[in-house]
């Protein structure tokens, strides 16, 4: 009686269960009454990452430098190439098909999380007691200067964009 279902890593064709090709190999010929499945290794710059019956291997992803991309991990016959972005840039999507410049945090905002090759800069507003007076992709909010520890007094209050201005204590009693 011909099978209606096959074991794991097999497929049903012409009423026979044939072995799938292992990762890194493509299907040439289905198994027959006389032969096992015929598989061939993927060529240079090709891959297949699953047990399969594909007759063509997939092309490795190309990390296009014109799009700001570079190779993070070279592909093998069983894995695709992984692209990442050049320094100062990050991927626009999970697939990392193109890159954009990391955003900078405006004055009044500091870097909460520095950008990586796959994620943009995360900014946060500087809370009371902190400031940022530059547009930067790296600078965090800095704490206001503590005038007291310098034996000085606040002459001008700080904001989220400016530090406090300290001055000498009024000596008149």
């Amino acid at each position: 009686e011909p099978p209606t279902a096959c074991r794991e890593k097999q497929y049903l064709i012409n009423s026979q269960c044939c072995s799938l090709c292992q990762p890194g190999q493509k299907l040439v010929s289905d198994c027959t009454e006389f032969t096992e499945t015929e598989c061939l290794p993927c060529g240079e710059s090709e891959f297949l990452d699953t047990w399969n019956r594909e007759t063509h291997c997939h092309q490795h992803k190309y990390c296009d430098p014109n799009l700001g991309l570079r190779v993070q991990q070279k592909g093998t016959s069983e894995t695709d190439t992984i692209c990442t972005c050049e320094e100062g840039w990050h991927c626009t999507s999970e697939a990392c098909e193109s890159c954009v410049l990391h955003r900078s945090c405006s004055p009044g905002f500091g870097v909460k999380q520095i950008a990586t090759g796959v994620s943009d800069t995360i900014c946060e507003p500087c809370p009371v007691g902190f400031f940022s007076n530059v547009s930067s992709a790296f600078e965090k909010c800095h704490p206001w200067t503590s005038c007291e520890t310098k034996d000085l007094v606040v002459q001008q209050a700080g904001t989220n964009k400016t530090d406090v201005v300290c001055g000498p204590q009024d000596r008149l009693r």
């Epitope: 072995s19 040439v28 010929s29 027959t32 006389f34 032969t35 096992e36």
Partner: antibody, heavy 113, light 112 residues
């Protein structure tokens, strides 16, 4: 439908060469394997070798080094190049597809002086 | 090279009676993937061989159910439950597990 047709047989002197062709139709040689079998007059069947779909070849010990199997995917033909022929190579040569029961009609090779 | 030994060489049978042919291999015919590529052919007089049984026990399409195959490892058998006139010819076992593929020497079935 699937067909295999052999040609190229004939009379050849010992030490001579001959090329048999197996023209196929109804299937692709890049997806199916084909093998050659021979049968000497009044004798049994002998497997000569095969051409796999992927292009690799295998041979029997009796003909390895003397016979070469090749194929032309575009011309849809498989060839058996026979050299240094001997009297014991006299036989009907069949090409066969490696699934189902698809045989050519056979072509007779006679090696005699 | 793997040898297939068939017995008997000649098999005279009365019409309607059963017949049995043995095929012994010089090494196991189980493949690395668990398949056993042992097959049976019938060559009728003046014709090319015709596939009867593939992979030990699978009847090829159009083959009458009076033909059956069995066995494993190195010992295999072809049985005909009731011989008919059209069954006359030479029966060959064949293996395609190991390269080079090989055939048995043949068993000639004739009617008594």
């Amino acid at each position: 439908q699937v067909q295999l047709v052999e040609s190229g047989g004939g009379l050849v002197k010992p030490g001579g060469s001959l090329r048999l062709s197996c023209a196929v139709s109804g299937f692709s040689l890049s997806r199916y394997s084909v093998y050659w079998i021979r049968q000497a007059p009044g004798k049994g069947l002998e497997w000569m070798g095969m051409m796999w779909g992927g292009g690799s070849t295998d041979y029997s010990t009796s003909v390895k080094g003397r016979f070469t199997i090749s194929k032309d995917n575009a011309k849809t033909s498989v060839y058996l190049q026979m050299s240094s022929l001997r009297a014991e190579d006299t036989a009907v040569y069949y090409c066969v597809r490696t699934d189902g029961d698809y045989w050519g009609q056979g072509t007779l090779v006679t090696v005699s002086s | 090279e793997l040898q297939l030994t068939q017995s008997p060489l000649s098999l005279p049978v009365t019409l309607g009676q059963p017949a049995s042919i043995s095929c012994r291999s010089s090494q196991s015919l189980a493949s690395s993937q668990g398949n056993t590529y042992l097959h049976w052919y019938l060559q009728r007089p003046g014709q090319s061989p015709r596939l009867l049984i593939y992979k030990v026990s699978n009847r090829f399409s159009g083959v009458p159910d009076r033909f059956s195959g069995s066995g494993s490892g190195t010992d295999f058998t072809l049985k005909i439950s009731r011989v008919e006139a059209e069954d006359v010819g030479v029966y060959y076992c064949s293996q395609s597990t190991h390269v080079p593929w090989t055939f048995g020497g043949g068993t000639k079935l004739e009617i008594k």
